[in-house]
Amino acid sequence: LSTCKTIDMELVKRKRIEAIRGQILSKLRLASPPSQGEVPPGPLPEAVLALYNSTRDRVAGESAEPEPEPEADYYAKEVTRVLMVETHNEIYDKFKQSTHSIYMFFNTSELREAVPEPVLLSRAELRLLRLKLKVEQHVELYQKYSNNSWRYLSNRLLAPSDSPEWLSFDVTGVVRQWLSRGGEIEGFRLSAHCSCDSRDNTLQVDINGFTTGRRGDLATIHGMNRPFLLLMATPLERAQHLQSSRHRR
Amino acid sequence: LSTCKTIDMELVKRKRIEAIRGQILSKLRLASPPSQGEVPPGPLPEAVLALYNSTRDRVAGESAEPEPEPEADYYAKEVTRVLMVETHNEIYDKFKQSTHSIYMFFNTSELREAVPEPVLLSRAELRLLRLKLKVEQHVELYQKYSNNSWRYLSNRLLAPSDSPEWLSFDVTGVVRQWLSRGGEIEGFRLSAHCSCDSRDNTLQVDINGFTTGRRGDLATIHGMNRPFLLLMATPLERAQHLQSSRHRR
Amino acid sequence: DIDECSQDPSLCLPHGACKNLQGSYVCVCDEGFTPTQDQHGCEEVEQPHHKKECYLNFDDTVFCDSVLATNVTQQECCCSLGAGWGDHCEIYPCPVYSSAEFHSLCPDGKGYTQDNNIVNYGIPAHRDIDECMLFGSEICKEGKCVNTQPGYECYCKQGFYYDGNLLECVDVDE
Amino acid sequence: ALDTNYCFSSTEKNCCVRQLYIDFRKDLGWKWIHEPKGYHANFCLGPCPYIWSLDTQYSKVLALYNQHNPGASAAPCCVPQALEPLPIVYYVGRKPKVEQLSNMIVRSCKCS
Amino acid sequence: ALDTNYCFSSTEKNCCVRQLYIDFRKDLGWKWIHEPKGYHANFCLGPCPYIWSLDTQYSKVLALYNQHNPGASAAPCCVPQALEPLPIVYYVGRKPKVEQLSNMIVRSCKCS
């Protein structure tokens, strides 16, 4: 504006860039860039790239909204994933195959390896690759609760689609519970929504990782895309740092 | 601060107050305070106070989070309420009383009087006064869709409670649909959540406005607190103003 | 050779002028600015003789308020007691003691600054920083500040002792 | 909204989101972030006029509140409104880590 | 968080939410708003330091980013974070109206 000092756009950009330098290190709780002396040669492992891409895809699907950010949320979250126990595991034998449900079990020791303390977990998502779907389907997600009871978690109305699509359910609270408990294997159930009157309660949707009789190489690809838990958590060493700096700035 | 110009807190407060003067008028699209020459003597009508209190209660229960605010959301919204058609209306006869559901119907002419155009509606909430509840109950809300079909909208897990409590369901999309269509009476159904296995599907929760055999005076109070739609909408005259200033600042 | 300077007149602006070279170009920068690492831009030099505010620490919740002095150079601040240097709450943290950056800013160590006006055998002479003159009212409240080489001493009245954290003379609690 | 769609295609002088791509190597001299190579950080810039709302109100001035001082601040400021996170891959020792950094990308701005 | 709980009970000089009650009659000279009589509008005030992050990083300085410049702005500014709406009752002619005004009450602030 005529009466103001002209804005030096280059200076503003430089200050923004310098602030980002500090911000990234600060979010990672690093005092300086990490030493790269031990980095092995060659490209990133496939699994790491897959995890990075999952996270990036999640971001693209997220609404860009500012959330009031508690202190713990300011800091970076490590992203890991835990694949569902494969369907040939004996745990699945206990649950009778039904037309209205599929079951997904997870090894809690793998979860604990990724997230040693329940309080460190900031988000857990159950990711399912749904294959093409001919008709609209209303599905419900349940958590295995006690011996033979299931607790309702959430539901989703799936529109018909010709292409596969990742479904994501927020299961943070459930996974936090699992980390606090002693169980070895915990699980989810995906069911057709059953109305009190209706009798047609078949689960029409085909979830990757459950169909059988595939060719060997396809089965491997298929297995990699089986349901998994995407976990975002504060690394343990960063959390200890956080606790020690609890006092107000 | 010691080296900077001292902040004149009084000046800041005065500027904030003056900005609020403009902000309120601007949000109401008023060029100056409205004339008070026609205001009738005496206190505000009971119904208006009740509506004001409903709105205030809603605010208190809302999380204080900034939402990215589209232009239309900046402006004030008029709040009205439309009560459910009373249960002795013949419309209810068509729907057999069942142990797992209750029905709520609304007169769309009343809705249109409150909100002449679907686009003006910014929020609609279905408010139900739930009476005390002995056991946890999982309920589902459905919208009357066609002759005898119902479309699932949402669900709620109700915790046991000794005191009555207002339940609120966001039904903005549904009411917007109703305002676009020609129907005279539209409705909701509140049902117990029915699992595919379970057979005990009774709706345990007691919703105000449905119990019968009350003493006359109690029935009236009871009737006032029957389910209603709380509507927030841009007044028509303000909306016309909005359309004419669609171009970017 | 492509003359990048005439091709893009905005190169090196707003704080320098473009000079064409064979196959490339460099920026000749205005006073107070220095070429960037690739010599394709100009950035402000934080000259040691610029005078700004000296901040005492970053522990305080109101560190913008913990100003030791208002008119000191980066060397006078960071080579003595300061934790940060700048103005209007825009702060350059002082380099950590014993780091390469600290030695570059304070080649003569804590408590000393270089005086470019006095040159002995072609090398700028070092002079002691007089903390009492620069920061006296802030670092020795209720006491008498005496400059030493390097550093300073704060003498308190009888019945008071010097608190190195508060930087003031505090009543001995008997 | 003062978002990338509007601001990147206009010459808006008031508060708006401005384009800024950060290349970790070129701009920060960092090679330690393996993915991504950089990102569109963007930033908010531009004045938010403070309008003294005298009692001689009139629509022209009041209409400006919506964009220039919707929060009725005593000193409105151009700040981020919608933000997005950024996932990165880097090594700690020999172990690659995927981490997500919250609120790193500015998608839109507002006067606040 | 820089919210009413923390800020109203501290002497924080940096960015914080400050108490401000607006009485429609006394402060604005308005009698036309019938409910409420006034409200706690509050406001944000206080500096947000900009820290030049030299490559001589160290934890003490980096820890300050969280509060003082979490968005890595070139000129961080103290602005509202959490806001709440305000319902009011006023008359248009003889008709009482209940209207809700969005984002009127400042509950917390942030450097942005």
């Epitope: 860039p33 030493s35 790269q36 002396g37 031990e38 980095v39 092995p40 040669p41 060659g42 490209p43 | - | - | 090679k31 330690w32 393996h34 090594y91 020999r94 | -």
Partner: antibody, heavy 119, light 107 residues
Framework: EVQLLESGGGLVQPGGSLRLSCAAS????????MTWVRQAPGKGLEWVSA????????YYADSVKGRFTISRDNSKNTLYLQMNSLRAEDTAVYYC????????????WGQGTLVTVSS | DIQMTQSPSSLSASVGDRVTITCRAS??????LNWYQQKPGKAPKLLIY???SLQSGVPSRFSGSGSGTDFTLTISSLQPEDFATYYC?????????FGQGTKVEIK
Amino acid sequence: EVQLLESGGGLVQPGGSLRLSCAASGFTFADYAMTWVRQAPGKGLEWVSAISGTGAHTYYADSVKGRFTISRDNSKNTLYLQMNSLRAEDTAVYYCARVSSGHWDFDYWGQGTLVTVSS
Amino acid sequence: DIQMTQSPSSLSASVGDRVTITCRASQSISSYLNWYQQKPGKAPKLLIYDASSLQSGVPSRFSGSGSGTDFTLTISSLQPEDFATYYCQQSYSAPFTFGQGTKVEIK
């Protein structure tokens, strides 16, 4: 300023041994992997060996595997190449270089030291 | 081991010319390719890393492109100080291999 200075080269008989050193300064030595590259007279560059920042991981070209040993002393900021069972084809200028952070490009090089294997 | 093949092995050019050197890998190496310049009697100098990133302090007339197996180093306008030998090197996996070099001479 980053500086690398090789030493220890010279004339040695086939089957003999030699130990090359590379003194580093101007950067935090332990934070970087280091490498040796050689160049036979009038020929191109040939990568010889590399070592991670802590010294925990080593890498060798097939042509020197089992005969050469790379090591480092981070307290002395020094890189070493122990060459045993030397052959005539090992005659070359040996360069030590710093491995740029994690990407395995070699961003700073020493001036080289000549090793001649001849009877 | 991954073989790196440079072409041409030598070329003659004049000051101001645009010069292109290519490098081919025996298998895909993504973008893990670096270019070096070496003058007689001197140590090599890093010009380009990760196929296209310009090393700090290197003039902008040097540029790199390509990914997978085929890569190119381009000097947009040859300067007197650019007459030297240029090597490509893969950093995809150990052993790290260099191309045989391309000598750029004055025409």
